[in-house]
């Protein structure tokens, strides 16, 4: 028997530094967790004590921080190197800034393998990027060799920014040719390292003959046997195991997300590559492992340019920016429309020509503006100006909910109206009229949405069964501010931008901003 | 006020096609919003929605029954149409139109139903 | 297609009396479920909306109540007016189905 020990992270996003419990800015030193420094000391660890060690991580390195907005990418390069990653799945948001954003800082820079074998490039991008992506690598790995194929969402195109020159094919169809290869150079131990979430990681677990562990991402899924240490709810036992259609059993794995854990899995396998065992669990990368100092000097060393980043003008508005309780909770608020008309824009993917675009609507609890930003400062908007209106290191994610489920949400948003609770909607997309002398649950007398499929968008009334994209705050698809049929009835979830990022790269776009209240939100009194 | 009102053969033999207006007043289906469902009861048994149709034309049916359905409208003589191919005796019920808001999933306004009777 | 059940399917009882009739579907239907009355010969009328909500002139002895895959109509001090057949909808997706009925006469 041969064992090896797989360690691995996904959804990392931008997350060098070390974070608090909840993955949002450290506050507290002594309960922070997570970071590249403290990650480092860990693997450092596992390695020096155990022979047959890969360290791999599953997609969505890019995106969630300032780190991310400032250096676009060389950080991920430059640290994962550091750690000395052996291989590296590409995620959705590996594209954010386009395939040259991928290509510059991450793939020309990377010293270890990324992979996917879904994504074929066409056209003039086949020469420039062939060769720095691979389907699959073979490690060698102690005496043995372990052979890493890799996958993306399919959904890529719609999530993020990879350009009209890369398919993204059917996960499970594009793996089989790439592990029967692995197959005919005689490599016998194969992982799927690959970001389409855990429905799809378990398909492939079923489907794909001859892989024999999945390492997954993109649904940030935390997976633990026995008391899990922090406050992530497993939704499964780690490993979880899938039964193959040809009856192997295949562990599945994945580490929840940004860095507070590293996913620890012991595969043993025997001589001919079936697996006999595996057991692990993730590790929580608490204040009890010391952060690397050697690493920890150079976060602080890159740290510099991001507080000089922070003070620089973004761009300007012509207008208050409201951003008041009082007005965000109550009304429609010119804040809230920009941030929405910003989250609209940073989604815009013409995919289809059926389709202006893909999503047009957006809806943002009113409590999580923070702040107004005054336009008397010489208009100038900074990072830091941004950071008070949104100071919870949150995304814009997209979901899929039914017709029923947004007038539901809809009537949450003012089932206590006047009492300046958070979960007022502000909207983008969306046409609504309140008629609060109504009952609590019966207020939404209008709702109409703008419509997708339409070569010029217009308003149309919202129906209950048919199936909406939408764009809101994580904190909104978790169902935060009670707006639990988010949580409950959504048909799909994807994670998205930083919030700061997404807002910013609008108004760096846009260069001058006037966002108005324009009837977004309306009130009115009588019959309908 | 809302007025729903349903019209159709009365009797008719089986294998043949079945059509039923409703004629409506009070709302338009030129109104953005606005939907027509036709709903059926046979004698002494429970409600069984058939098929729907938008402002917008656009349709929804009941899967089980689908393949023999057809829903149709004509806005400007406020009138929504349905046929149903091949019938037989167990197509034989009160046949109801109601109006439903597409922001309700309730039907809030009901014909009187017409009785439609399949006989050999 | 999600299924709705009702029970009873009969009940006999007298005026005064509360009375509660059930509903469960076959999958989460999320609340979206609407109660209708039928009296013999006539069409059905709406009393509930949003499993809660009464419907406009419903009196409020009439109440409605449940989650996820089970809901009730509860009708308080029954009055000789209330008699017929109740029906449940769901409209949480179509096929839009009804429950198949509940006849409640006087005792």
């Known amino acids: 028997a041969w064992e090896l020990t797989i360690l691995h992270t996904n959804d990392v996003h931008s997350r060098l530094e070390q974070t608090s419990e909840d993955s949002s800015k450290c506050v507290n030193a002594s309960r922070c967790m997570g970071g590249v420094a403290r990650l480092f000391t860990k693997v450092q660890q596992i390695r020096r004590a155990e022979p047959n060690v890969l360290l791999l991580d599953a997609g969505d390195q890019y995106q969630g921080t300032i780190w991310f907005t400032v250096y676009k990418g060389a950080e991920v390069a430059h640290f994962m190197n550091a750690l000395r990653y052996d291989a590296m799945a590409l995620g959705n948001h590996e594209f954010d800034n386009g395939v040259e954003g991928l290509i510059e800082p991450l793939l020309k820079e990377a010293k270890f393998p990324i992979l996917s074998a879904n994504i074929k490039a066409k056209g003039p991008l086949a020469s420039q990027i062939s060769g720095l992506y691979l389907p699959y690598k073979v490690l060698p790995v102690g005496d043995e060799v372990v052979g890493i194929v890799g996958y993306t969402s399919k959904e890529t195109p719609f999530l993020s920014n990879p350009g009209t020159n890369l398919v993204f094919e059917d996960e499970i169809t594009a793996l089989q040719p790439e592990v029967d290869k692995l197959k005919t150079l005689n490599v016998n131990k194969i992982i799927a390292l690959g970001h389409s979430g855990f429905e799809m990681d378990k398909l492939i677990a079923q489907k794909v003959r001859g892989v024999d562990v999945v390492v997954g991402g993109h649904s940030n899924t935390f997976l633990y046997t026995g008391n899990p240490p922090s406050k992530e709810v497993p939704a499964g036992k780690y490993p979880f195991i899938v039964t193959s259609d040809d009856g192997r059993k295949v562990p599945v794995v994945q580490a929840y997300a940004f860095g507070k854990y590293l996913g620890y899995l012991k595969i043993e396998f025997d001589e001919r590559g079936n697996v006999i065992s595996s057991h692990g669990n993730p590790i929580l990368l608490n204040s009890s492992i010391p952060e690397d100092p050697s690493i920890k000097a150079d976060i602080n060393k890159w740290r510099i340019k991001l507080d000089n980043y922070s003070t620089q003008e973004l761009g300007k508005t012509i207008v208050y920016l409201d951003g008041s309780s009082q007005s965000c909770r109550f009304r429609e608020c010119n804040m809230g429309n920009l941030i929405c008309d910003a989250m609209i824009n940073n989604n815009l993917r013409h995919t289809d020509e059926m389709f202006w675009n893909h999503v047009s609507m957006c809806i943002l609890n009113g409590g999580g503006i923070r702040s107004p930003i005054d336009e008397r400062n010489n208009g100038t908007i900074t990072w830091e100006n941004l950071a008070a209106v949104l100071p919870f290191g949150g995304t814009f994610d997209l979901v899929q909910l039914k017709g029923s489920t947004l007038k539901k949400a809809f009537e949450h948003s003012v089932h206590r109206y006047g009492q300046s609770t958070g979960e007022f909607l502000q909207v983008g997309g969306i046409h609504v009229v309140y008629d609060l002398s109504r009952k609590p649950g019966d207020r939404v007398v209008k709702l109409d949405v703008l419509c997708t499929k339409c070569r010029v968008p217009s308003y149309d009334p919202l129906k209950m069964d048919e199936v909406y994209k939408v764009i809101l705050p994580n904190f909104l698809a978790n169902g935060g501010d009670g707006f639990q049929m988010i949580k409950d009835e959504l048909l799909r979830h994807d994670s998205g931008d930083q919030d700061i990022n997404v807002v910013s790269t609008y108004i760096s776009k846009m260069k001058v901003i006037y966002p108005a209240v324009e009837g977004r939100i309306k009130f009115s009194t009588g019959s309908h | 006020q809302v007025t729903l009102k349903e019209s159709g053969p009365g009797i008719l033999q089986p294998s043949q096609t079945l059509s039923l207006t409703c004629s409506f007043s009070?709302?338009?289906?030129?109104?953005?919003?606005?939907?027509v469902s036709w709903i059926r009861q046979p004698s002494g048994k429970g409600l069984e929605w058939l098929a729907h149709?938008?402002?917008?034309?656009?349709?929804r049916y009941n899967p089980s029954l689908k393949s023999r359905l057809t829903i149709s409208k004509d806005t400007s003589s406020n009138q929504v149409f349905l046929k149903i191919t091949s019938v037989d005796t167990a197509d034989t019920a009160t046949y109801y139109c109601?109006?439903?808001?597409?922001?309700?999933?309730?039907?809030?306004?009901w014909g009187q139903g017409t009785l439609v009777t399949v006989s050999a | 297609d999600i299924q709705m059940t009702q029970s009873p399917a009969a009940l006999s009882a007298s005026v005064g009396e509360t009375v509660t009739i059930t509903c469960r579907a076959s999958?989460?239907?999320?609340?979206?479920l609407a109660w209708y009355q039928q009296k013999q010969g006539k069409s059905p009328q709406l009393l509930v909306y949003?499993?809660?909500i009464l419907a406009d002139g419903v009196p409020s002895r009439f109440s409605g109540s449940g989650s996820g895959t089970q809901y009730s109509l509860k009708i308080n001090s029954l009055q000789p007016e209330d008699f017929g057949t109740f029906y449940c909808?769901?409209?949480?997706?179509?096929?839009?189905?009804f429950g198949g009925g509940t006849k409640m006469e006087i005792k």
């Open positions: 009070g709302f338009s289906l030129s109104t953005s919003g606005m939907g």
């Open positions: 109601a109006r439903r808001r597409s922001l309700d999933g309730w039907f809030a306004y």
């Open positions: 999958g989460n239907i999320h609340n979206y």
């Open positions: 949003n499993t809660q």
């Open positions: 909808q769901h409209f949480w997706d179509s096929p839009w189905t």
């Open positions: 149709i938008y402002w917008d034309d656009d349709k």
